[in-house]
Amino acid sequence: LRLLDHRALVCSQPGLNCTVKNSTCLDDSWIHPRNLTPSSPKDLQIQLHFAHTQQGDLFPVAHIEWTLQTDASILYLEGAELSVLQLNTNERLCVRFEFLSKLRHHHRRWRFTFSHFVVDPDQEYEVTVHHLPKPIPDGDPNHQSKNFLVPDCEHARMKVTTPCMSSGSLWDPNITVETLEAHQLRVSFTLWNESTHYQILLTSFPHMENHSCFEHMHHIPAPRPEEFHQRSNVTLTLRNLKGCCRHQVQIQPFFSSCLNDCLRHSATVSCPEMPDTPEPIPDYMPLW
């Protein structure tokens, strides 16, 4: 988790002088509770936005937006703590909005936004906005939380972000798989424009089962420059096992930008359709 290295972060708006500060996620009001605390945020919304760094890289960011309740507690509102928690790693990053002037009611509901938390493709987060000061130990909570799911690199907008492109999102191998005679599969795919090796992982399954009955790995050496964007054709020999008929072919590239962690592409061959009634055997065999 990190903040976008963007120009100076601002939270000021007409009628409010405000500054954004790094936070330890442990506001002073936890340790020194105040008697009067503001109410919780209203209508917290989290959306996926995209932002460029100063270097021109494009990253997915969490766009956080919320409004204030229209009660007198805004007179005691000194700021807000924004927290993003990556659910699996338990990594948390916080910033603090520090209000440098008192809030006053005005004709519009107060609205705040922040779009500088960089998020990772295909990851899950919890976003929390805490109004400051935080409540006394038994006081009503004055925060609102929402979970946030970042799409993976297959998502159209995500595909062109720097982290996705680094993992090979622009490569479309256009895999085709055909079943040949004598228990063989012919796999064809388009090579990317990089001299790197590939691995084909074949996993076979019985018709309605998810436990594999055959596995095979095939190494493809790095192509020469003149072979970039060309089709690579590989014939794989299957084990002759009755009913082991559903085949998943996965192609793993080893691009320099992502090494062992590049996006994999796969294609599946289903078991042949079984006719409802067996075909009758003809009484005679035609000679032509």
Partner: antibody, heavy 116, light 107 residues
């Protein structure tokens, strides 16, 4: 091929404990958390909680607090769910599923029957 | 906890029919909703995540829409393998709660 393979069916007496395992393969185990969901016979799905495979952090359904424990063994890419003080209404198929917010891969389920 | 209410609880349809299942949340959940399909004796299968994103490998006849409190799963042309029970699930706030399910039966 991502797979979650669960342990076999169990029959337990009321008051006993059960521990269900869920072995993951086909992906980096510590990249995605594991959630547990159960389904009583003929009923809908009920979220039980989750465990972070990276940090070991857990989040349990309120009504199961004190009775459920979720753990992982990263060396074997296996998640475990233990439920104690079993009651007849704990009879259900218990599923593990990958991730916290969208359950994109599921185990085949483990039937736990609680009967005296 | 956020309550999820599906309707109808069951429906009968024929192959080729357009089928619509709705799910209503007890409070605003943005687009934090998934749809699952479950066949008897099998684990659920993810169809749609974040209200409208089709999971990889799911046929294009399945689509999801909605935001806020009202959501819809549509099967544009019902196939024989689509007869199953469908569940919605919200993940805006924990605990992640499921709808009670909609059983799609053959007419």
């Amino acid at each position: 091929q991502v797979q979650l393979v669960q342990s076999g069916a169990e029959v337990k007496k009321p008051g006993a404990s059960v521990k269900v395992s869920c072995k993951a393969s086909g992906y980096a185990f510590s990249r995605f958390g594991i959630s547990w969901v159960r389904q009583a016979p003929g009923q809908g799905l009920e979220w039980m909680g989750w465990i972070s495979t990276y940090s070991g952090n857990t989040n349990y359904a309120k009504h199961l607090l004190g009775r459920v424990t979720m753990t992982t063994d990263t060396s074997t890419s296996t998640a475990y769910m233990e439920l104690r003080s079993l009651r007849s209404d704990d009879t259900a198929v218990y599923y593990c599923a990958r991730r916290f917010l969208k359950f994109d891969y599921w185990g085949q389920g483990t039937l736990v029957t609680v009967s005296s | 906890d956020i309550q999820m209410t599906q309707s109808p609880s069951s429906l009968s349809a024929s192959v080729g029919d357009r089928v619509t299942i709705t799910c209503r949340a007890s409070q605003d959940i943005d687009s934090s909703l998934n749809w699952y399909q479950q066949k008897p004796g099998k684990a659920p299968k993810l169809l749609i995540y974040a209200a409208s994103n089709r999971e990889s490998g799911v046929p294009s006849r399945f689509s999801g829409s909605g935001s806020g409190t009202d959501f819809t799963l549509t099967i544009s042309s019902l196939q024989p393998e689509d007869f199953a029970t469908y569940y919605c699930q919200q993940w805006a706030n924990m605990p992640g709660t499921f709808g009670q399910g909609t059983k799609v039966e053959i007419k």
